[in-house]
Each structure stands twice: as structure tokens, then as C-alpha cells.
């Protein structure tokens, strides 16, 4: 039986300040059951960037249609990028539980922010 893969195809993405950044993530299976979340950074101090069910993330939108059935594309778009957004972003699959348990992380995508062209 194949193990679930969390695929972040780009190692790095460079975006001009003020533009939007697209961070790609796909999974190879709909199971195990459980949500996907996006974080900036790794370890206990990581910052939650997007979680569909909880929190308010006004600058972050899913790339795929939120009513799409059996979606395996969990890419996100972050609008109005600033230098403070630079860092490595991880797409993380959780196994459903009480609480949910981290199962597998993508390899990460490093976001660098270029100065806005004058």
C-alpha cells in the first residue's frame, strides 16, 4: 500500500512586494482522514498560515474551488506580499483525532520577497 505523499513541487518562490504568491501543494491520496494546514517555519514556534476551519486569514485563499469534490490540491495564494512574509512555508497533513495529529509535511517552499520595482 502506497504511503501518503505531500508534494510541494517548488523549493523556492520569489515574489515582488505587493504582488500575490502562490504556494503549491498536492497530496497523493484522500486518506488517512484529516485536514491540511499551512505553516510558516518548522518546530514548536511555527506560525499557522491557513486552516480552513478555524481562524481568520484574510490574505490567504485556496487556489482550488472550495466546493470541489475529492480535492487533492491544497495550494494557497497569499495576497499583498510584504518583506515580513519571507520564510519557508510548509503544507502539513494531519490525521483526524482529538486533537488532530501531524502525519506528514511537505518539503517546504521558501518564499523570498523582492523590492517592488519602481
Amino acid at each position: 500500500e502506497e504511503e501518503l505523499q505531500v508534494i510541494q513541487p517548488e523549493k523556492s518562490v520569489s515574489v515582488a512586494a505587493g504582488d500575490s504568491a502562490t504556494l503549491n501543494c498536492t497530496v497523493s491520496s484522500l486518506i488517512p482522514v484529516g485536514p491540511i494546514q499551512w505553516f510558516r517555519g518548522a518546530g514548536p514556534g511555527r506560525e499557522l498560515i491557513y486552516n480552513l476551519k478555524e481562524g481568520h486569514f484574510p490574505r490567504v485563499t485556496p487556489v482550488s474551488d472550495p466546493t470541489k469534490r475529492n480535492n487533492m490540491d491544497f495550494s494557497i495564494r497569499i495576497s499583498n506580499i510584504t518583506p515580513a512574509d519571507a520564510g519557508t512555508y510548509y503544507c502539513v497533513k494531519f490525521r483526524k483525532g482529538s486533537p488532530d495529529v501531524e502525519l506528514k509535511s511537505g518539503a517546504g517552499t521558501e518564499l523570498s520577497v523582492r523590492a517592488k520595482p519602481s
Epitope: 500500500e1 502506497e2 501518503l4 497523493s28 491520496s29 484522500l30 486518506i31 488517512p32 482522514v33 484529516g34 485536514p35 491540511i36 480552513l52 476551519k53 485556496p62 472550495p66 466546493t67 470541489k68 469534490r69 475529492n70 480535492n71 491544497f74 490525521r95 483526524k96
Partner: antibody, heavy 120, light 108 residues
């Protein structure tokens, strides 16, 4: 076309066991969660159990007595039911889970069901 | 556990009439509601998911609406083949998945 065919139902006495099977075809069985939902005679729908990969979830009413499993090489879902009680009498439906958005499962295809009767 | 309350329990309707079913959740379930139709002796059939998205092949006389705790299934013009029981289901917070008690539609 998606097809789900349940088998294994029948009449048993309280305390006995039964194993239900659900043969699936027409979709990539191994990447979908699968569930059992039951319906007591003349009553509404009650979720019983769901399996993802090796992750399993149960209703409190069956926890510790029922075990859900799957064999992806045979495209088959199972429900092992032990210590059966009169209140387990129902039609048991096998259902294919579907997800929408980033979370949440509902049931987009159902089998015709198999009747389990627990009676002394 | 999230409790879903459906009303009314039974509806007696003439073909061609507009029919509205209600499903109320005991807490916020966002838009994570599905609707099913079950005819006597048959398995349930998915009609609507994500509160308002019609499943493939479902006639456009069926529509769903609502978010949070209050949801509605509407049949714009009831056909004779629409008799049966209609169930809502929440999948926002599980286990357990929970279903409403159902609304039975009888043809007048």
C-alpha cells in the same frame, strides 16, 4: 459506474458475531475513506464507522464491539460485529466517502444494504 | 455531538407545489451539510453537499441554502417521483457524523 454490494447479513442471537463485507468497483477504492451507516426498521440513518487508511472511527454505540477494516487488494470493506445486541438490528449500508473543500466527509454512493437481525 | 433537527416530520404535498424542508444544527456547522433522499426499500441518494452544491445528475428543481445553523432544501416543483424521506447530515465536527431525523414527503 460505482457499485457497492454488501453481503453477510442474517439472523443471529444476542452475543453472537457476524462479519459484513462490501465489494466495491468502479472507482479507485484505495484512496477513499469508506463507511458503514445503519438504519433500524422504520427509523432514521445512524452512522456506524469510517475507515481511512489505517485510521478508524466508531460511533460510541458500537465502540469496542465492532471493527471496520479494508482489503485494498480485493477492493473490499468489512465490518466485524461482535457481542451483538437486539438494538443492532438494522439494514447496514456500505457507503463511499467523498470530501469537499479541505475537510469533511459525506457519502456520495451507497450500497443496497444488508439486513442484520439480532433476536433470541 | 452536533444534533440536527428537521422539520416538519411529515409533509403532504401535491405535484407541482413548491416544498421547503428545514434542518437546524445545535451549533455552527459552517456549510458542511449534505442532503439525501431515500425512497421506500432503497438506499439513500446524495442530493446536495456543501449546503448548496447539487450532486451530479440531480435535477435543478432541487436546491439547498443556508450556513451556520439553519439550512433549507427546496424542491421548486414537486414531481411524483420525489416522494420519500429527506435527511440532512453534518460533517463539520465528527465523529460522530450525525443525521437529522428526516422529513417524510407524501404525495397528496
Amino acid at each position: 459506474d460505482v457499485q457497492l454490494v454488501e453481503s453477510g447479513g442474517g439472523v443471529v442471537r444476542p452475543g453472537e458475531s457476524l462479519r459484513l463485507s462490501c465489494a466495491a468497483s468502479g472507482f479507485s477504492f484505495s484512496i477513499y475513506a469508506m463507511s458503514w451507516v445503519r438504519q433500524a426498521p422504520g427509523e432514521g440513518l445512524e452512522w456506524v464507522s469510517t475507515i481511512g487508511a489505517d485510521d478508524t472511527y466508531y460511533a460510541d454505540s458500537v465502540k469496542g464491539r465492532f471493527t471496520i477494516s479494508r482489503d485494498n487488494s480485493k477492493n473490499t470493506l468489512y465490518l466485524q460485529m461482535n457481542s451483538l445486541r437486539a438494538e443492532d438490528t438494522a439494514v447496514y449500508y456500505c457507503a463511499k466517502d467523498s470530501t469537499v473543500g479541505w475537510s469533511g466527509d459525506f457519502f456520495d454512493y451507497w450500497g443496497l444494504g444488508t439486513l442484520v437481525t439480532v433476536s433470541s | 455531538e452536533i444534533v440536527l433537527t428537521q422539520s416538519p416530520a411529515t409533509l403532504s404535498v401535491s405535484p407541482g407545489e413548491r416544498v421547503t424542508f428545514s434542518c437546524r444544527a445545535s451549533q455552527n456547522v459552517r456549510s458542511d451539510i449534505a442532503w439525501y433522499q431515500q425512497k421506500p426499500g432503497q438506499a439513500p441518494r446524495l442530493l446536495i453537499y456543501a449546503a448548496s452544491s447539487r450532486d451530479t445528475g440531480i435535477p435543478d428543481r432541487f436546491s439547498g441554502s443556508g450556513s451556520g445553523t439553519d439550512f433549507t432544501l427546496t424542491i421548486s416543483s414537486l414531481q411524483s417521483e420525489d416522494f420519500g424521506v429527506y435527511y440532512c447530515q453534518q460533517y463539520y465536527d465528527w465523529p460522530p457524523f450525525t443525521f437529522g431525523g428526516g422529513t417524510k414527503v407524501e404525495i397528496k
